[in-house]
């Protein structure tokens, strides 16, 4: 049940996370399942355990097998299994199916290809990207953080994409490669200047002091997948993250597809325990895409005490 397949190439680094969820700082013991022999934690070993991670620096074909991890506490032991397979490097350019990570699909408006498993490694930009073993060159390809963006995607951009990066461990460098297929969807979509559906511009919302309230910022950006479409709240012209008031939190944006196919995104601003000073703030709903930025402002006002209706959204 708590088992996960992991694979890598000989002479490359491979890092595997314990498939059993724990929390950081808990003791995690790793064992070779077949022999029940404990895996060392000393970093001088080629294969060593480091908390929730098992590191092969570098991996060898003989490392293939099942590894047991146990997240330990005096009252809970959580056991997981990592099924590791290390393959010989292919002499030719062909990447066999068993080395492929999940396929991703893109379109003219949305062509991000994430480098699989990279978050487990200590790497520094830039990533190198290859398609069918050829290094990607030209202004259409942009390596951005842990993903590749392709401008003006066409059907012949479909294929196998390999990311290559260097993992650094205590000053030693190890190569890592990962490959996944990219397919192109033919999508008749379009992008347009953002339209904010809520709130109305210069809207005022009545709230009760001491109660909780939610403000929803919702905007539509066109039809089909959008390359860039974000909504966010600002307080008095500042980002929420720059505004050190833990009572006021912004939820992550959520994509919404409507029956008419519009690509819309919303984000909720949650205000706990509304205070008088919150009524003095300007709340800006910002919608941004490649066409530009639109802003709607909403303010809070104290609810008339005679009106006893609930103010929850």
């Amino acid at each position: 049940k708590f088992s996960k397949q992991s694979w890598g190439l000989e002479n490359e680094a491979l890092i595997v996370r314990c498939p059993r969820q724990g929390k950081s700082s808990y003791i995690v013991d790793w064992y070779y399942s077949q022999t029940n022999k404990s895996i060392p934690t000393q970093e001088r070993n080629r294969v060593f355990a480091s908390g929730q991670l098992l590191k092969f620096l570098p991996a060898e074909v003989a490392d293939s097998g099942i590894y047991t991890c146990i997240v330990r506490s005096p009252t809970f032991n959580r056991t997981g299994y990592a099924n590791v397979t290390i393959y010989k490097k292919q002499p030719d350019c062909n990447v066999p199916d068993y080395l492929m990570y999940s396929t991703v699909s893109g379109s003219e408006k949305n062509s991000k290809i994430y480098c699989p498993t990279i978050d487990l490694y200590n790497w520094t930009a830039p990533l190198e990207w290859f398609k069918n073993c050829q290094a990607l060159q030209g202004s259409r390809y942009k390596a951005h953080k842990s993903f590749l963006v392709i401008d003006n995607v066409m059907t012949d951009d479909a294929g196998d994409y390999t990311c290559k990066f260097i993992h650094n461990e205590n000053g030693a460098n190890y190569s890592v490669t990962a490959t996944r297929s990219f397919t192109v969807k033919d999508e008749q979509g379009f992008s347009r200047f953002p339209v904010i559906r809520a709130p109305a511009h210069n809207e005022t919302k009545e709230v009760e002091i001491g109660e909780n309230t939610n403000l929803t910022c919702s905007a539509c950006f066109g039809k089909g997948a959008q390359f860039l479409a974000t909504v966010q709240w600002q307080l008095n012209g500042n980002k929420i993250t720059d505004f050190s008031e833990p009572r006021i939190q912004q939820e992550e944006g959520q994509n919404q597809s409507f029956s008419n196919g519009l690509a819309c995104v919303n984000t909720v601003l949650r205000i706990a325990d509304v205070k008088e000073e919150d009524l003095l703030l300007r709340y800006d709903c910002l919608a941004l895409n490649l066409h530009g930025l639109r802003r709607h402002t909403i303010r809070l006002s104290r609810k008339n005490p005679i009106d006893h209706q609930s103010t929850y959204c």
Epitope: I27, S73, P74, F76
Partner: antibody, heavy 117, light 111 residues
């Protein structure tokens, strides 16, 4: 995100049984974690009552002897508290909570239960 | 059962100042270099909320002004600087053995 929603009666007569339900959304109770019941007496003292883990195995606080049990309905993603032969001493706010490992990470909203004739 | 004794029972601290809450266990809750003590915050009408696990690890989303320390039988929760929304009751809980037990709580108010 894991969310726990509690339901059950607010008033129970002495010597009767108390039954409460905790409905979990955002996570399957058979995937992992332990699913606890905790109560808070008037005066705010908290007492851990026990848990049922993802596999259905239970662990109880010995202070509740054999009066207490936790069961589950995996098809509805719910787990239940049953406390038999209640007395006025069982008047409390009852919480369900989930445990990733050791600590109580997510809590239900609480159900206030009064034992009175 | 391991008994957890919190002190003080109540505490008033000025905004911007440090609040310190203690929790003493009747026997050690540490083993293998880890301390199995956790801290919660509870506001009226709400369930407790996890702040710190394993004595000193900040739960995700909890502000950095909260910190925990200690090992063996003596543990401390610090809030620095005290903010208005920190007025609440704070509880310690151990998971060294069954049954888990909680401290009696410390009510923190604004001076």
């Amino acid at each position: 995100d894991v969310q726990l929603q509690q339901s059950g009666p607010g008033l129970v007569k002495p010597s009767q049984s108390l039954s409460l339900t905790c409905t979990v959304t955002g996570y399957s109770i058979t995937s992992d974690y332990a699913w606890n019941w905790i109560r808070q007496f008037p005066g705010n003292k908290l007492e851990w009552m026990g848990y049922i883990d993802y596999s259905g195995s239970t662990t109880y606080n010995p202070s509740l002897k054999s009066r207490f049990s936790i069961t589950r309905d995996t098809s509805k993603n719910q787990f239940f508290l049953q406390l038999n032969s209640v007395t006025t001493e069982d008047t409390a706010t009852y919480y369900c909570a989930s445990t990733v490992i050791d600590s109580m990470d997510y809590w239900g909203q609480g159900t206030s239960v009064t034992v009175s004739s | 059962d391991i008994v957890l004794t919190q002190s003080p029972a109540s505490l008033a601290v000025s905004l911007g100042q440090r609040a310190t809450i203690s929790c003493r266990a009747s026997k050690s809750v540490s083993t293998s270099g880890h301390s199995y003590m956790h801290w919660y915050q509870q506001k009226p009408g709400q369930p407790p909320k996890l702040l710190i696990y394993l004595a000193s690890n900040l739960e995700s989303g909890v502000p950095a002004r909260f910190s925990g320390s200690g090992s063996g039988t003596d543990f401390t929760l610090n809030i620095n600087p005290m903010e208005e929304e920190d007025a609440a009751t704070y509880y310690c809980q151990h998971s060294r053995e069954f049954p888990f037990t909680f401290g009696s709580g410390t009510k923190l108010e604004i001076k």
